[in-house]
C-alpha cells in the first residue's frame, strides 16, 4: 500500500522539521499527483511505489514491523509490513500495533498493564547499541559480498544499525542509508504517533542515545500538536504521558 511505502522509516529517524537538513522546507515532490510529502524535495520522483526494504523493525513506521513478505520466504528479503491487530498471531512485540504487545504468540492489549507504554521508549527509542529484539528473533544478513572488516564510520553506507560503529545508527539520507550519530541530550527528535504522520522521510535522524527518550520539550507543551518540539531527554522513573 502507499502507506506502507511512505511510513517505512525508523520511529526516531526523521526528516528535520527544525534544525536539520536546511534547504528542504516542504518542497513539492513530483510523485503521485496531488500528494505533498513532508521533507520531500523537488528533485525526487517516485516512478512506482515499492515495498520499503528493511533489516530491523526500527526502520519501519510505528504501525509496521520488518519481516519477509511470504511465509517461509527468503529471510534475506524483508520489507515493512502492516502491524498486527489485537488477537492476531505474532512472534515478537514489534509485530503488534501500538497499544498491544505479543503474549504467548497473540497480540494482546497493553492498556491494562502499561507494558508496551513503559518499555516502548527503552526499547525503540533508547536501545543505544543493543539492537536485539525481545523474542530473540534472528535475521539473516544481506550484506554485500565485500565483507566489511570494520564498523562503518559517519558517512559510511549501511543496511542496518549494527553495521555502524558505536554511537552511530543506520539512517536514510536521500538514496542511501548511512551511519549517522545517535542523538545526544537536548537534540531535536520527532516521535511519530499516528500512521501517515511522517510522510516520505528522505532525511532520517538517529534515535536518542542510551538513557534518553524522545519527549516533548517542556516549554513547547502549549504549542499546537503539529508543531510540538521533541528533544532527547533523560529518563524519569515515572512515565504517565503515554498516549495510545
Amino acid at each position: 500500500t502507499l502507506n506502507s511505502v511512505l511510513n517505512s522509516n525508523a520511529i526516531k529517524n526523521l526528516p528535520p522539521p527544525l534544525g536539520g537538513a536546511a534547504g528542504h522546507p516542504g518542497s513539492a515532490v513530483s510523485a503521485a499527483p496531488g500528494i505533498l510529502y513532508p521533507g520531500g524535495n523537488k528533485y525526487q520522483t517516485i516512478d512506482n511505489y515499492q515495498p520499503y526494504p528493511c533489516a530491523e523493525d526500527e526502520e519501519c513506521g510505528t504501525d509496521e514491523y520488518c519481516a519477509s513478505p511470504t511465509r517461509g520466504g527468503d529471510a534475506g528479503v524483508q520489507i515493512c509490513l502492516a502491524c498486527r491487530k489485537r488477537r492476531k498471531r505474532c512472534m515478537r512485540h514489534a509485530m503488534c500495533c501500538p497499544g498491544n504487545y505479543c503474549k504467548n504468540g497473540i497480540c494482546v492489549s497493553s492498556d491494562q498493564n502499561h507494558f508496551r507504554g513503559e518499555i516502548e521508549e527503552t526499547i525503540t527509542e533508547s536501545f543505544g547499541n543493543d539492537h536485539s529484539t525481545l523474542d530473540g528473533y534472528s535475521r539473516r544478513t544481506t550484506l554485500s559480498s565485500k565483507m566489511y572488516h570494520t564498523k562503518g564510520q559517519e558517512g559510511s553506507v549501511c543496511l542496518r544499525s549494527s553495521d555502524c560503529a558505536s554511537g552511530l545508527c543506520c539512517a536514510r539520507h536521500f538514496w542511501s542509508k548511512i551511519c549517522k550519530p545517535v542523538l545526544k541530550e537536548g537534540q531535536v527528535c520527532t516521535k511519530h504517533r499516528r500512521k501517515g504522520s511522517h510522510g516520505l522521510e528522505i532525511f532520517q535522524r538517529c534515535y536518542c542515545g542510551e538513557g534518553l527518550s524522545c519527549r516533548i520539550q517542556k516549554d513547547h507543551h502549549q504549542a499546537s500538536n503539529s508543531s510540538r518540539l521533541h528533544t532527547c531527554q533523560r529518563h524519569h522513573h515515572h512515565h504517565h504521558h503515554h498516549h495510545h
Epitope: 511505502v5 517505512s8 528535520p16 536539520g20 537538513a21 536546511a22 534547504g23 528542504h24 524535495n41 528533485y43 525526487q44 520522483t45 517516485i46 516512478d47 512506482n48 515499492q50 515495498p51 520499503y52 526494504p53 544481506t142 550484506l143 554485500s144 559480498s145 565485500k146 566489511y148 564510520q153 559517519e154 558517512g155 559510511s156 553506507v157 543496511l159 539512517a171 539520507h173 536521500f174 538514496w175 542511501s176 548511512i178 549517522k180 550519530p181 532525511f203 535522524r205 538517529c206
Partner: antibody, heavy 117, light 111 residues
C-alpha cells in the same frame, strides 16, 4: 571484486533516443543505490540520475522529463533511457554506486554518447 | 542548488611538495553531525576515484598522504608529499542536498 560495466553509447541525432546499460557484479546489487554521472568533453563532472535500493528515483532539472533511470535487480543491471537528446548531452556517461561510503565510491569505465547531426 | 568553488584552478608543484586544494560551498554542507563533502581524483581517460568522503574520512585503499579537513563551507584536500602518480584533476562534491554538485576541479600539474 566490484565491477560496473557500461554499454549502449554511440552517435545519435538531436531529438533521438538512446538506452545505456550498466552491468554490476561483486556486490548485492539490490541493496544499494546506483547513479549515472556524466562528463562532457574537457569539462567537469555532472550528476545525471540516481535510484535507491527501494527504487525511488532522483534527477536534476537538466534531464528531468527526458531521462529515466531504472534498475533490474534480477539481472544486476542499471539503465538510463535518454530521450529528446540534445547536443549538450554529449558526454562520457559513468555508472557509479554508493557501496561503502555516502559518495560515488565505485565507478564504471564509462560509455561515450555523442549527440550530433 | 549548492555551488562549489574550487581553487586554484591549476596548481603547479614538484614531486615531494605539499599540495593544498580548496573547496568552498555556497552554503553549509554540514548536517546530522556529518560534513557531506567528498573528494575525487581523475586522471586522463579514466573514471574518477574516491579519495575522501564525509569531509575527512579516507576511501578504501587510499594512501595516507591524502587527507581532508574543514567544516561548514570551507574544505581542504591536502596531499602531504606529491608522488608522480598524484598529478591529476581533483574534484570536490557535496551530497548534502539533491542535486549533488561538483566543483569545477583543480588540476595539479608538474612544475
Amino acid at each position: 571484486e566490484v565491477q560496473l560495466v557500461e554499454s549502449g553509447g554511440g552517435l545519435v541525432q538531436p531529438g533521438g533516443s538512446l538506452r545505456l546499460s550498466c552491468a554490476a557484479s561483486g556486490f548485492t546489487f539490490s541493496s544499494y543505490a546506483i547513479s549515472w554521472v556524466r562528463q562532457a568533453p574537457g569539462k567537469g563532472l555532472e550528476w545525471v540520475a540516481s535510484v535507491s535500493g527501494w527504487l525511488d528515483t532522483y534527477y536534476p532539472d537538466s534531464v528531468k522529463g527526458r531521462f529515466t533511470i531504472s534498475r533490474d535487480n534480477a539481472k544486476n543491471s542499471l539503465y538510463l533511457q535518454m530521450n529528446s537528446l540534445r547536443a549538450e548531452d554529449t558526454a562520457v556517461y559513468y555508472c557509479a554506486t554508493s557501496l561503502e561510503n555516502y559518495a560515488f565510491d565505485y565507478w564504471g569505465q564509462g560509455t561515450t554518447v555523442t549527440v550530433s547531426s | 542548488e549548492i555551488v562549489l568553488t574550487q581553487s586554484p584552478a591549476t596548481l603547479s608543484l614538484s614531486p615531494g611538495e605539499r599540495a593544498t586544494l580548496s573547496c568552498r560551498a555556497s552554503e553549509s554542507v554540514d548536517d546530522f553531525g556529518i560534513s557531506f563533502i567528498n573528494w575525487y581524483q581523475q586522471k586522463p581517460g579514466q573514471a574518477p576515484r574516491l579519495l575522501i568522503y564525509a569531509g575527512s574520512k579516507q576511501g578504501s585503499g587510499i594512501p595516507a598522504r591524502f587527507s581532508g579537513s574543514g567544516s561548514g563551507t570551507d574544505f581542504t584536500l591536502t596531499i602531504s608529499s606529491l608522488e608522480p602518480e598524484d598529478f591529476a584533476v581533483y574534484y570536490c562534491q557535496q551530497l548534502k542536498e539533491v542535486p549533488p554538485t561538483f566543483g569545477g576541479g583543480t588540476k595539479v600539474e608538474i612544475k
